[in-house]
């Protein structure tokens, strides 16, 4: 067991251009605090994985009000160290996340006015008992300077806090099989401390806190004798005559898990799966608190006001759940209107709008015809997010700027000849055909399939297409 200690030296603008704006103002004074989350190992763990080594929240720093016009200075910091106790061995390699939070002190009603200013993360090697290590990390335009160390809590010593030491009982030497504790030569390695209550006669341990049973004994503390039985069933009636060894009462018999925990048997004993708010071997420890670092993904933990809110995680945008463990698929709510494409960038939502639409959610239908002139007497028609010109006769193209060749599509049927005309086209029909497009045959007896031709037009005259 031991403690990881973090000392924040400064938080302020980093070097280089683009100094950040002060997070506080005369209208909105604020103060800073920090959260540290530790995970074992050097692997790139998911941001939402728990702070398995522990977490801690600093006190609030002094209230700070920005001086108008002044650049953001190093901001006033909370007093004291951030301390993260660890119960087991120090892993030697660890990952950290240090978050800088701002608490606004205006008169907001209804919710905490907290916001995450900066988050830095890293992976380091560190031996327990060593000197303070100094570090500088940058997050955007901000710079965080800090030191950290891991120290063992007596009687643990060593680079992993796994060796236990006791003052010597005799002035000259340590007991049988026990070495002096370097560098504390006046102390001796102590026997391992087994799990509390582990039977001294029937149990032993190879790691601190465990309890392994000698043959013939079982149970979490090696206090339950293995019974002899008829072997007819795993929990069969006891009979000393067969000499057959079977397990005695099962480790989950009577459910040793308190507070609604569920028990499952393991090769050695049992394991309790605890409901939220409880932990410990038998779920006997109530009230997971903020010190246990229950909030993931940069969620801010505050103690609750009643037993069902033992701790509360205030989640950053994009996360939800009682521990901020769930990423919100904000695009599933289809926030982008008018067929816009939704992009969840984590810190924000973006909508990529189709042509003709604009606004944060593509909610504005642009006036497609605004500033769009259709040439040569064409008129603009809005529709579907794009403008279209309805062109006057003889003109075409997107803006009616192109002179149309009405004969290009060969509109005259049955070999009729096409002539371009200022008002459109005219078909000169081949003998035996008539109509605007020469589409009607003239009957051999001279009668037409159409009603009589209008006065002044004989069948076979070119028909003008109006």
């Amino acid at each position: 067991a031991g403690v990881f200690e973090l000392q924040i030296h400064s938080f302020g603008p980093g070097p280089g251009p683009g100094a950040p704006r002060s997070p506080c103002s005369a209208r909105l004074p604020c103060r800073l605090f920090f959260r540290v989350c530790l995970k074992p190992g050097l692997s790139e763990e998911a941001a939402e994985s728990p702070c398995a080594l522990g977490a801690a929240l600093s006190a609030r720093g002094p209230v700070y009000t920005e001086q108008p016009g002044a650049p953001a200075p190093d901001l006033p910091l909370p007093d004291g160290l951030l301390q993260v106790p660890f119960r087991d061995a120090w892993p030697g390699t660890f990952s950290f996340i240090i978050e800088t939070w701002r608490e606004e002190l205006g008169d907001q009603i209804g919710g905490p006015a907290w916001s995450l200013l900066a988050r830095v993360a890293g992976r380091r090697r560190l031996a327990a008992g060593g000197p303070w290590a100094r570090d500088i990390q940058r997050a955007g335009a901000w710079e965080l300077r800090f030191s950290y160390r891991a120290r063992c809590e007596p009687p643990a010593v060593g680079t992993a806090c796994t060796r236990l030491c006791r003052p010597r009982s005799a002035p000259s030497r340590c007991g049988p099989g026990l070495r002096p504790c370097a560098p504390l030569e006046d102390e001796c390695e102590a026997p391992l401390v087994c799990r509390a209550g582990c039977s001294p006669e029937h149990g032993f341990c190879e790691q601190p806190g465990e309890c392994r049973c000698l043959e013939g004994w079982t149970g979490p503390l090696c206090t339950v004798p293995v019974s002899t039985s008829s072997c007819l069933s795993p929990r069969g009636p006891s009979s000393a005559t067969t000499g057959c060894l079977v397990p005695g009462p099962g480790p989950c018999d009577g459910n040793p898990c308190a507070n609604g925990g569920s028990c499952s048997e393991t090769p050695r004993s049992f394991e309790c799966t605890c409901p939220r708010g409880f932990y410990g071997l038998r779920c006997e420890v109530s009230g997971v608190t903020c010190a246990d670092g229950p909030c993931f993904n940069g969620g801010l933990c505050v103690g609750g006001a009643d037993p069902d809110s033992a701790y509360i995680c205030h989640c950053p945008p994009g996360f939800q759940g009682s521990n901020c463990e769930k990423r919100v698929d904000r695009c599933s709510l289809q926030p982008c209107r008018n067929g816009g494409l939704c992009l969840d960038l984590g810190h924000a939502l973006r909508c990529r709008c189709r042509a003709g639409f604009a606004g944060p959610r593509c909610e504005h239908d642009l006036d497609d015809c605004a500033g769009r002139a259709c040439a040569n007497g064409g008129t603009c028609v809005e529709g579907g997010g794009a403008h279209r010109c309805s062109c006057a006769l003889g003109f075409g193209g997107r803006d009616c700027r192109e002179r149309a060749d009405p004969c290009a599509a060969r509109p005259c049927a049955h070999g009729g000849r096409c002539y371009a005309h200022f008002s459109g086209l005219v078909c000169a029909c081949a003998p035996g055909y008539m109509g605007a497009r020469c589409e009607f045959p003239v009957h051999p007896d001279g009668a037409s399939a159409l009603p009589a031709a209008p006065p002044g037009l004989r069948p076979g005259d070119p028909q003008r297409y109006l």
């Epitope: 905490p112 608190t289 505050v302 006001a305 037993p307 509360i312 009682s322």
Partner: antibody
Framework: EVQLVETGGGLVQPKGSLKLSCAVS????????MNWVRQAPGKGLEWVAR??????????YYADSVKDRFTISRDDSQSMLYLQMNNLKIEDTAMYYC????????WGQGTLVTVSA | QAVVTQESALTTSPGETVTLTCRSS?????????ANWIQEKPDHLFTGLIG???NRHPGVPARFSGSLIGDKAALTITGAQTEDEAIYFC?????????FGGGTKLTVL
């Protein structure tokens, strides 16, 4: 802003019944436990009842003074909290408040229940 | 049934620091009692000040703070103002039952 609005108070005779309602807005009602608290005229505060959320099986708890007479319930779909009061006594006369404990304590404006012959 | 005890009345002057306490008949108050403090002003106007021992509501002035002092929960007003004159109730949770103290009448002269 969290809002709690109580209704349903009034004048009732001893042994009579009354049902109080509390409309809740601006927070995820389904997630949290809810409470009723009362204050008799000129007296201090007295906790009356508590109902937990669905994941805690809507477990209910009562002050000894109202046990077996009052019933707390909730309608998560409507974000409503209720207190059914039966067999009312003169000492139940009080201002009744819907109270929500989360990171802080949130109070409604109260509704007055008067039990009088 | 637990009993929660508060000072019945306290008097302070503007600018002074005053501490109100909340004692439990069952032993030391701990964070598992989720001590909360409520202010009552005339006309049944209740305001939650502190929840969970030391969480101050964002709308509450910074001069109010909650803590555990010895075996009691405490509400400290650093630099009392005349508008802080009110009755202050503390509430303690015992599992799923809430017990209120009798209230402290604070006078700011």
């Amino acid at each position: 802003e969290v809002q709690l609005v109580e209704t349903g108070g009034g004048l009732v005779q001893p042994k009579g019944s009354l049902k109080l309602s509390c409309a809740v807005s601006a927070f995820t009602f389904t997630t949290y436990a809810m409470n009723w608290v009362r204050q008799a005229p000129g007296k201090g505060l007295e906790w009356v009842a508590r109902i937990r959320n669905k994941s805690n099986n809507y477990a209910t708890y009562y002050a000894d003074s109202v046990k077996d007479r009052f019933t707390i319930s909730r309608d998560d779909s409507q974000s409503m909290l209720y207190l059914q009061m039966n067999n009312l006594k003169i000492e139940d006369t009080a201002m009744y408040y819907c109270v929500f404990y989360y990171d802080y304590v949130y109070w409604g404006q109260g509704t007055l229940v008067t039990v009088s012959a | 049934q637990a009993v929660v005890t508060q000072e019945s009345a306290l008097t302070t002057s503007p600018g002074e620091t005053v501490t109100l306490t909340c004692r439990s008949s069952t032993g030391a108050v701990t964070t598992s009692n989720y001590a909360n403090w409520i202010q009552e002003k005339p006309d049944h106007l209740f305001t939650g000040l502190i929840g969970g021992t030391n969480n101050r509501h964002p709308g509450v002035p910074a001069r109010f703070s909650g803590s555990l002092i010895g075996d009691k929960a405490a509400l400290t007003i650093t630099g009392a103002q005349t508008e802080d004159e009110a009755i202050y109730f503390c509430g303690l949770w015992y599992s799923n039952h809430l017990v209120f103290g009798g209230g402290t009448k604070l006078t700011v002269l």
